[in-house]
């Protein structure tokens, strides 16, 4: 029987800069029941605090609700593991909420095949930002990425959409059923999970164009840019 091994705080994430959760990995248990506690203080403060909520984030976690979350302060935290034989402490982790944001996936992904009479057909998609993110405050700039593939294909084709919530793609295989997904990330932070897949059947008479792909501006009614395959690689994030 031994004191517990050193725990490690391995991840902290915030969905929206208003709340955040941190998770730790226990060290070895020393063969005895072990209690874990997370303590922290904020930059410029010597008063120590304890995790306010060990439940919401699941096992080995600490959740900081709105009244415990500040964008403007660095948190300095550590986890203490204690059993009957002694204690051990994790290394201190410095957490700035601004840099740990991982949003929920975008919502309401809609995909349609558009076949205008005077132009080539294209795949048009639009989506909404995740509900927890308030873009009106200016605290957030969300960037989007789309991926799609024929249903039976192994490889995804990925497109960077910038801040747009609408996107057009030419160059699809006629007669194929495609899966389309979208994800987002804040300017500082982590990519969300991919949204649930939306399926779209490409008509057999869809005109294939391998040379060009069409990406819309934010307003589809506005000017549109033709981007060559070569230029498009600058927009790819695989």
């Amino acid at each position: 029987q031994l004191p517990p091994g050193k725990p490690e705080i391995f991840k902290c994430r915030s969905p929206n800069k208003e709340t955040f959760t941190c998770w730790w990995r226990p060290g070895t248990d020393g063969g005895l029941p072990t209690n874990y506690s997370l303590t922290y203080h904020r930059e410029g403060e010597t008063l120590m605090h304890e995790c306010p909520d060990y439940i919401t984030g699941g096992p080995n976690s600490c959740h900081f609700g709105k009244q415990y979350t500040s964008m403007w302060r660095t948190y300095v935290m550590m986890v203490n593991a204690t059993n009957q034989m002694g204690s051990s402490f994790s290394d201190e982790l410095y957490v700035d909420v601004t840099y740990i944001v991982q949003p929920d996936p975008p919502l309401e992904l809609t995909v349609e095949v558009k076949q205008p009479e005077d132009r080539k057909p294209y795949l048009w998609m639009k989506w909404s930002p995740p509900t927890l993110i308030d873009l009106k405050t200016g605290w957030f700039t969300l960037l989007y990425e789309i991926r799609l593939k024929p249903e039976k294909a192994a490889e995804w084709e990925t497109h960077f959409a910038g801040q747009q919530t609408e996107f057009k793609i030419l160059s699809l295989h006629p007669g194929q059923k495609y899966l389309v997904q979208v994800r987002c990330k804040p300017d500082h932070g982590y990519w969300s999970a991919w949204s649930p897949a939306t399926f779209i059947q490409i008509p057999s008479d869809f005109i294939m164009n391998d040379e060009q792909k069409l990406i819309s501006e934010e307003d589809l009614g506005g000017e549109q840019k033709l981007i060559s395959e070569e230029d498009l690689h600058h927009h790819h994030h695989h």
């Epitope: 120590m48 304890e50 060990y54 609700g65 009244q67 500040s70």
Partner: antibody, heavy 118, light 107 residues
Framework: EVHLVESGGGLVQPGGSLRLSCAAS????????MNWVRQTPGKGLEWISH????????YYADSVKGRFTISRDNAKNSLFLQMNSLRAEDTAVYFC???????????WGQGTLVTVSS | EIVLTQSPATLSLSPGERATLSCRAS??????FAWYQQKPGQAPRLLIY???SRATGIPTRFSGSGSGTDFTLTISSLEPEDFAVYYC?????????FGQGTRLEIK
Amino acid sequence: EVHLVESGGGLVQPGGSLRLSCAASGFTFSSYEMNWVRQTPGKGLEWISHISSRSVIIYYADSVKGRFTISRDNAKNSLFLQMNSLRAEDTAVYFCAGITIFGIPEYWGQGTLVTVSS
Amino acid sequence: EIVLTQSPATLSLSPGERATLSCRASQSVSSYFAWYQQKPGQAPRLLIYDASSRATGIPTRFSGSGSGTDFTLTISSLEPEDFAVYYCQQRSSWPITFGQGTRLEIK
């Protein structure tokens, strides 16, 4: 609606003991850092003890260290202050207060009077 | 411990006037600083936290400023219910300490 209700105050002789209780309702007691604050006409407001959500972190003011013990029972939404070796200068209104790190929302009871006199 | 000194001890003003209350800390408390209002027979009520953020339900006429060692509470236009005792408080380090109070009274 939030309520913090202190009880256990009263008249006690110097050297005696009292146990103050604070019953909490209407908020997530187990998430809050809880505190005892006292107010005397002479010294004004004095923050005397602090206990973290699961009692891992406890602070005492030097004036009560070694004599007072703070504790909590999250299952019963209750905060306690065991006061031993009481002195005349401990005479005060004792408030319990629930705070977060920013103090919002911040909840206070209405206080219980402790009088130490022979 | 960090000592907080409030000035003035008493401030006599009329409703509608502007009140400026000051508090100086014996060492830097960053912005971990609060202001309270207390009326007779009541518990203190949090007005301002983190030096300049208004607590829930506090009217906009109350504002806080400052960082480090010098802090100010301003009441832009006094209402009759604002006459009370005001305390400053630091939450940077233990022991948490209060100032001795400023009594705001009707002139």
